[in-house]
């Protein structure tokens, strides 16, 4: 079931979920991709003080970068 994630555990979980995309705790975009990356309460409030699932954690991943054409 869902569990709380804090400190280094939270960072490890984000690295696992986001992979090469990376992640950030900062400003969401105004609209479009990543504009709803994070719930209003913030990742610590959402995942450390309470439990959160992987889908919610993924909202903090950086957007996928389109593949560069040759």
């Amino acid at each position: 079931g869902p569990e709380t994630l804090c400190g280094a555990e939270l960072v490890d979980a984000l690295q696992f979920v986001c992979g090469d995309r990376g992640f950030y705790f900062n400003k969401p975009t105004g609209y479009g991709s990543s504009s709803r990356r994070a719930p209003q309460t913030g990742i610590v409030d959402e995942c450390c003080f309470r439990s959160c699932d992987l889908r919610r954690l993924e909202m903090y991943c950086a957007p996928l970068k389109p593949a560069k054409s040759a």
Partner: antibody
């Protein structure tokens, strides 16, 4: 609890400007985009634009570029919208609304602007 | 600009009826982050709008389960399984995958 408290109704002259406010409380004001929405009497909702209070970044819908100017003061958790060169077309109720993961989940009560000579 | 076309614009119902509102977008609202940026709002007479459904099909906290959202890409639907008096008002779809826009609104009213 989250609240967005807007300033009171305005009666203004054509050609003038008006600045309305939206005071936020109960959440981290700087970390969420604040949106502004227009509703003319008996009409639908029009998205005007949005501001990120953390750094002042803005996005505007085309029709409102040059008409609306969005600003925010993080120290007082207040967002502002100034409307310039007012005409009768600007007579409307204006709403502020924060947007986050759940969409625009909290709205102000609306500010009525009446443009009349 | 993305245009959202709502149908019908007026929807007369009896209490207890099922109601269905369509919202069609001129562009796909599926974003590269895997989310589809389509929400539904209700504005009751004399009140500020309130969110009902976010990201196509998720009911906002406190919204009764008689409300449901569905769809993908460019075609979306809001359904009310059994209309109650408190549901009367104007329903708007809203997209924020591109520069945000609202649909024109659907007025749910009594026959």
């Amino acid at each position: 609890q989250v609240q967005l408290q807007q300033s009171g109704a305005e009666l203004v002259r054509p050609g003038s400007s008006v600045k309305i406010s939206c005071k936020a409380s109960g959440y981290a004001f700087s970390n969420l985009w604040m949106n502004w929405v227009k509703q003319r009497p008996g009409q639908g909702l029009e998205w005007i634009g949005q501001i990120y209070p953390g750094d002042g970044d803005t996005n505007y819908y085309g029709d409102f570029k040059g008409k609306a100017t969005l600003t925010a003061d993080s120290s007082s958790s207040t967002a502002y919208m100034q409307l310039s060169r007012l005409t009768s077309e600007d007579s409307a109720v204006y709403f502020c609304a924060r947007i986050g993961y759940y969409g625009m989940d909290y709205w102000g009560q609306g500010t009525s602007v009446t443009v009349s000579s | 600009d993305v245009v959202l076309t709502q149908t019908p614009l007026s929807l007369p119902v009896n209490i207890g009826d099922e109601a269905s509102i369509s919202c069609k977008s001129t562009k796909s609202l599926l974003s590269s982050d895997g989310l589809t940026y389509l929400d539904w709002y209700l504005q009751k007479p004399g009140q500020s709008p309130q969110v009902l459904i976010y990201l196509v099909s998720n009911r906002f906290s406190g919204v009764p389960d008689r409300f449901s959202g569905s769809g993908s890409g460019t075609d979306f639907t809001l359904k009310i399984s059994r209309v109650e008096a408190e549901d009367l008002g104007v329903y708007y779809c809203f997209q924020s995958n591109y520069l945000p826009t609202f649909g024109a609104g659907t007025k749910l009213e009594l026959k």
